[in-house]
Interface confidence: low
Amino acid sequence: DTYKSEIAHRFKDLGEQYFKGLVLIAFSQHLQQCPYEEHVKLVREVTEFAKTCVADESAENCDKSIHTLFGDKLCAIPSLREHYGDLADCCEKEEPERNECFLQHKNDNPDIPKLKPDPVALCADFQEDEQKFWGKYLYEIARRHPYFYAPELLYYAIIYKDVFSECCQAADKAACLLPKIEHLREKVLTSAAKQRLKCASIQKFGERAFKAWSLARLSQRFPKADFTEISKIVTDLAKVHKECCHGDLLECADDRADLAKYICENQDTISTKLKECCDKPLLEKSHCIAEAKRDELPADLNPLEHDFVEDKEVCKNYKEAKHVFLGTFLYEYSRRHPDYSVSLLLRIAKIYEATLEDCCAKEDPPACYATVFDKFQPLVDEPKNLIKQNCELFEKLGEYGFQNALIVRYTKKVPQVSTPTLVEVARKLGLVGSRCCKRPEEERLSCAEDYLSLVLNRLCVLHEKTPVSEKVTKCCTESLVNRRPCFSALTPDETYKPKEFVEGTFTFHADLCTLPEDEKQIKKQTALVELLKHKPHATEEQLRTVLGNFAAFVQKCCAAPDHEACFAVEGPKFVIEIRGILA
């Protein structure tokens, strides 16, 4: 359909509430440092303008693209250069270059303090102005996660509001709120990481990479749906994510709603697990479909070899319709293997493609590709063995100990990476233990590898901003599906020149005693990374001794009557002790 005014079209499709929410998210993801009130002003102006276009689509400027309208709004901010520096240079460009320029300035690691929930204050805010409370949530999440999936954020904001509706009535607000907020926070962080990987795959590896990923995932989840049905959903889903990753949030939300409608209208041919989802309102419906349980496999599936090895037309099919043929292979393999990670399925498809590429040029192709399925086994064994070993290590060491083992492992592999990034990434990698190791055997592999893909993407995104390690760049850019095996295969960097010993790095203060447990752990783990950067060849025994002594030193000073005085006296002794142990 063609519309005279795109903004009027989106306003009518989405309704005022969602339209405002999405515009707020869009501005917050671009101008991550602006105060909330500034954004509200911009949203108000855009909404008023959209309403004039709804009333008269021929009114002045109503025919302009949303990129043009949004970009003009951003560029009209008087303090843009003052607060955002070179972002203002984008304003000298024309569309579509201007929008591309804005996207490049999104900051994945913004300079924004961590949110600390204060139940009493939050309930007061909630009761005073629910609309503002909802908006503030969208703003705070969007500015911290500039690639957050916007329509999904609207869903989380509704859940957030529901939590407060319930808990602000409770006698003990904190007891009701804090666990629920923490649970929601984990969901939101996972959602942010999932979307960041989707955007990275589209932006760095192209739409085809994202479509392959979606094809595998949806084939696992909806094994009863046929290839054409899955392909149609994959194409539509790729459009939705391309739009959201590209900052076209209104179009993205609108198209996502259309896709949910299509899936629900055709659920009989897609999955038996969607009925409950399709009875829900729009945002919950889309979320529910995205999280839907895996359907049961059809009973009458042919052995895979039939179509992909034994068939005499394999090479003809491959040559004449490469993408479709490989797509059907990935679809058929994935629906039969709900236990495999998406990355593993894509690696298998890559090997299959490479084998056909090679064999179909030979004199006797069938003889050449007859054993292609045997080549898949080592690909399956590698992550399975790795997960087995790491889960055993996790059981033995517990979460904190396992994180420390990963800190040691990764600091030795890529010591050039900044300390905060190594700590963040290793801590997140360490969470795979509690997330996946307790799962049944058939869920472990997909749980672990798909989660690790999210964490390693975070490393790649952070590293891309300031590349410091050729090894990291290589693992991040050569192949999306081989990132995890690439990082796993890295060995300690023998070329690394150890960092000078800086005493200040191991200077601690009384604030350590009052920190929450996780922040205390981060301080200790930061020291561990710095220690390894100074002494990359430190033995496990030396590190264990240092960490033990550190714990004793902190415990001693935190039990002392004057914490700070104790740290001032014992700190230098501890540093001497460290140097002695590592000498």
Epitope: D86, N107, N109, D111, P113, S418, T419, P420, T421, K465
Partner: nanobody, 126 residues
């Protein structure tokens, strides 16, 4: 609002050392890009050294590499510049600047730093 306050300047002989400090308030020093610039009489502000926010990556002007070291103490919310082997041409007012919202020193252009301290004078002379 970010406030920056430099100290540690003074008169020093060629070949001598000084340590400048820049205390920040209103924002954590480890969360944002911070840099030292200097301005000699009648000249523009020139980039000396910088350190990324959340990433321990340091940047130096060619003229000071190997002689100056930038560091920060997150617990004290303070940025430092250790200056060794000082030369007469290092004489200038030294300023620290910060770019909130930019965790990395992606620019050595003074205009892109919205927040500055009042400066501290370093004189290298015999």
């Amino acid at each position: 609002e970010v406030q920056l306050l430099e100290s540690g300047g003074g008169l020093v002989q060629p070949g001598g050392s000084l340590r400048l400090s820049c205390a920040a308030s209103g924002r954590y020093i480890d969360e944002t890009a911070v840099a030292w610039f200097r301005q000699a009489p009648g000249k523009g502000r020139e980039f000396v050294a910088g350190i990324g926010g959340g990433v321990d990556i340091t940047y130096y002007a060619d003229s000071v590499k190997g002689r100056f070291t930038i560091s920060r103490d997150n617990s004290k919310n303070t940025l430092y510049l250790q200056m060794n082997s000082l030369r007469p041409e290092d004489t200038a007012v030294y300023y620290c600047g910060t770019r909130p919202g930019r965790p990395l020193i992606t620019s050595k252009v003074a205009d892109l730093y919205p927040y500055w301290g009042q400066g501290t004078l370093v004189t290298v002379s015999s």
